[in-house]
């Protein structure tokens, strides 16, 4: 804080507010009889800049020229030092350093809409740190002038509050902005324009779309515009897309036909306007109109696959599966699937509509030649039916693909490879690779996946519905006319040692040997495809190494005989399971003593 100047004065030249880089002259002078006691030669006047001494002088006054002050406020204090006493504050001064305004740049003016008012913006340039007055001047025909001022440190926008009219659209107007503060002034370059240059139309409004006869091919977009609009830009895109389609139209008079819209797609539409071909600026984009195009009948055909399961000597179960049409093929909401089953010789046919499912199961006689046709229907019609003759897909041994292998390929992918069948490979019309989670019970409810591969391919990467640490039963079918051959393999995308071993549930004695039965390891604990089981045994209370028997894994097997046990010796038995990654921990331990005679 600076105290009032009772003992002396500080004067500042040229002003307390100076230009950055300029010099300020500070004079400190004592008032009469305010010096040191005795005589004035003992007076020592000291000038401080903030808390740092910058000058001193013996006598009644001190004059100091100061340069290099930074932007903002710098505090100077003048003090008197007498012998054998503390320094006494005489007076202080604050000097404020600012900047003269730079020339305002990029002055541009705009009138929003035919009824709007003229407003201009500019770039102020460097911050002056000072109150700067901006005066915006507009001169027009017939010596008309308008002026507007704004008095703010950060002024870069002014609205004249006047409306230019289109009576003489080619008349010239000139705008100029002048910035003035206590350290200087500067004016922008003049900006000259006509009505057509600066009027930016209001964005179009009241946008509507009409589809004649509910058809996507007969679509008209309607909107309203200001009266003088000559040009329009339309942009539209599917709501889930980032890329716009753009159309420029002249003299559209508020309507335009769109010919390339896709059916059953939600689109976003926006329109912009302009008054002149090459003068002026485009309006802002209108608010978006969102609208769904009408449905059209589906295109494309369903991908259909099937499974046959023997029930008894006279009946078989057929399970049909199909994949959803892509959005672009469905062209609407699929209401149902139509499945037709026909016995080809007798001509009997049954048709069923399936909703909410992409599969269908039925039981048919094992005799006769059967065919199915499946199509998808929306509100406008049906897709072409996919026809399939039901055959024994694995009957032709010579068509079976050879050397089928399944290998992990990165995260959640399995690469299936095969060799063409022995029979003339050129007879193969296509391969189908089918996969489903392996369930020991052979559960038919497990989802089925498949993909089709061209006849010249000998590999396929399967990735759909593949999970880590799950074993899949993979089949490769080679199809040729009404014949098929198949080969199967187990595969997984990622594996580790099983989390547990099989649980022995029974040991029974049969003619001097034993039969061990076990429960399968739960699927979620198998951690991939099992390769082997191991049965371990050793005499109870013995420290010797256990003996073991390794059995190749088969899905349906859950018992195995052992005939190398000695009678009347108590054994401890347990089991483990192995994947390619390693062996599980022990399953439960069971004790058993064979009662039969010794050999």
């Amino acid at each position: 804080k600076i105290d009032a100047c009772k003992r002396g004065d500080v004067t500042v030249k040229p002003s307390h507010v100076i230009l950055l880089g300029s010099t300020v002259n500070i004079t400190c002078s004592l008032k009469p009889r305010q010096g040191c006691f005795h005589y004035s030669r003992r007076n020592k006047l000291i000038l401080y800049k903030f808390d740092r001494r910058i000058n001193f002088h013996h006598g009644h006054s001190l004059n100091s020229q100061v340069t290099g002050l930074p932007l903002g406020t710098t505090l100077f204090v003048c003090k008197l030092a007498c012998i054998n006493s503390d320094e006494i504050q005489i007076c202080g001064a604050e000097i404020f350093v600012g900047v003269a305004p730079e020339q305002p740049q990029n002055l541009s003016c705009i009138q929003k809409g035919e009824q709007g008012t003229v407003a201009c913006t500019w770039e102020r340039g460097r911050d002056t740190h000072l109150y700067t007055e901006y005066t915006l001047q507009l001169s027009g025909p017939k010596n008309l002038t308008w002026q507007k001022q704004c008095k703010d440190i950060y002024c870069d926008y002014l609205d004249f509050g006047i409306n230019l009219t289109p009576e003489s659209p080619e008349s010239n107007f000139t705008a100029k902005v002048t910035a003035v503060n206590s350290l200087g002034s500067s004016s922008s370059l003049p900006s000259t324009f006509t009505f057509l240059d600066i009027v930016r139309p209001l964005p179009p409004w009241d946008i509507r779309i009409k589809f004649q006869k509910a058809s996507v091919s007969r679509c008209t977009l309607y909107w309203r515009d200001e009266g003088l609009v000559l040009l329009n830009r339309l942009r539209y895109r599917p709501s889930n897309s980032r890329l716009w389609n753009m159309v420029n139209v002249t003299k559209a008079k508020g309507r335009h036909d769109l010919l390339d819209l896709k059916p059953f797609t939600e689109y976003e539409f926006q329109i912009s306007s302009k008054l002149h071909l090459y003068k002026g600026s485009w309006s802002d984009w209108s608010e978006s109109l969102r609208a769904q195009t009408p449905e059209e009948e589906p295109t494309g055909m369903l991908d259909v696959w099937y499974m046959k399961r023997h029930i008894d000597y006279s009946r078989q179960q057929i399970s049909l599966f199909w994949k959803n049409l892509s959005v672009s093929e469905a062209r609407g909401k699929i209401l149902h699937y139509q499945v037709t089953l026909q016995e080809l010789t007798g001509g009997k046919a049954m048709t069923q509509n399936i909703t909410g499912h992409t599969s269908w199961t039925t039981v048919i006689p094992r005799t006769g030649n059967w065919a199915v046709a499946v199509s998808a229907a929306n509100s406008k019609g049906s897709s072409l039916p996919t026809r399939i003759n039901i055959m024994n897909l694995c009957e032709a041994g010579l068509l079976a693909p050879r050397q089928v292998s399944a290998n992990s390929e990165g995260m959640d992918n399995i690469l299936v490879t095969w060799q063409p069948p022995r029979k003339d490979p050129s007879a193969v019309q296509e391969y189908v690779v089918e996969w489903r989670e392996l369930h020991p019970g052979g559960d038919t409810q497990v989802p089925l996946n498949w993909l089709r591969s061209r006849p010249y391919n000998v590999s396929a990467l399967i990735s759909e519905n593949i999970k880590s640490y799950i074993c899949y039963e993979i089949r490769v079918y080679a199809l040729s006319g009404d014949q098929g051959g198949c080969s199967s393999i187990l595969g997984n995308s990622k594996h580790k040692a099983p989390l547990s071993g099989p649980h022995i549930n029974a040991i029974t004695e049969e003619k001097g040997s034993i039969l061990i039965s076990w429960n399968s390891i739960p699927v979620q604990e198998q951690m991939g495809c099992l390769l082997h089981y191991r049965i371990y045994w050793k005499e109870r209370d013995s420290n010797s190494q256990p003996q073991l028997c390794e059995i190749p894994y088969r899905v349906s097997q859950n018992s195995h005989p052992i005939n190398s046990l000695q009678p009347r010796v108590t054994y401890v038995l347990w089991m483990t399971a192995l994947t390619a990654a390693g062996e599980s921990s022990h399953g439960n331990e069971r004790e058993f003593c064979l009662q039969g005679k010794a050999n």
């Epitope: 004067t11 604050e94 440190i153």
Partner: nanobody, 119 residues
């Protein structure tokens, strides 16, 4: 913003004296600098004298020794004592207050008071 009200102007004979007074109201805290400027017909506005918050002063060369500026910080009043007036001192005198505003200065001006010195 600060509102400034000038008073004390009038007609005076050459060699006479006048005291101009300016009172600041509104958000008058942190007034860094109070100044008197003048504008004669057909001329640019020029600084006459200024006084800082701490009491330091600046005078235009043309008035040094004749005019004295003083300030009462408590009442936010600044006076300009004008002695030995000359016809060339005739002008509209404006009071100005500069306030600290962040790291900038914000200025406010009074409406002005007429001083006429007749010969």
């Amino acid at each position: 913003q600060v509102q400034l009200q000038e008073s004390g102007g009038g007609l005076v004979q050459a060699g006479g004296s006048l005291v101009l007074s300016c009172a600041a109201s509104g958000s008058a805290a942190l007034i860094f600098l109070m100044s008197w400027y003048r504008q004669a017909p057909g001329k640019q506005r020029e600084l006459v004298a200024e006084v800082s918050r701490g009491g330091s002063t600046t005078y235009a060369d043309s008035v040094e020794g004749r005019f004295t500026i003083s300030r009462d910080n408590a009442k936010n009043i600044v006076d300009l004592q004008m002695n030995s007036l000359k016809p060339e001192d005739t002008a509209v005198y404006y009071c100005k207050a500069d306030q600290n505003y962040g790291d900038s200065l914000r200025s406010s001006w009074g409406q002005g008071t007429q001083v006429t010195v007749s010969s």
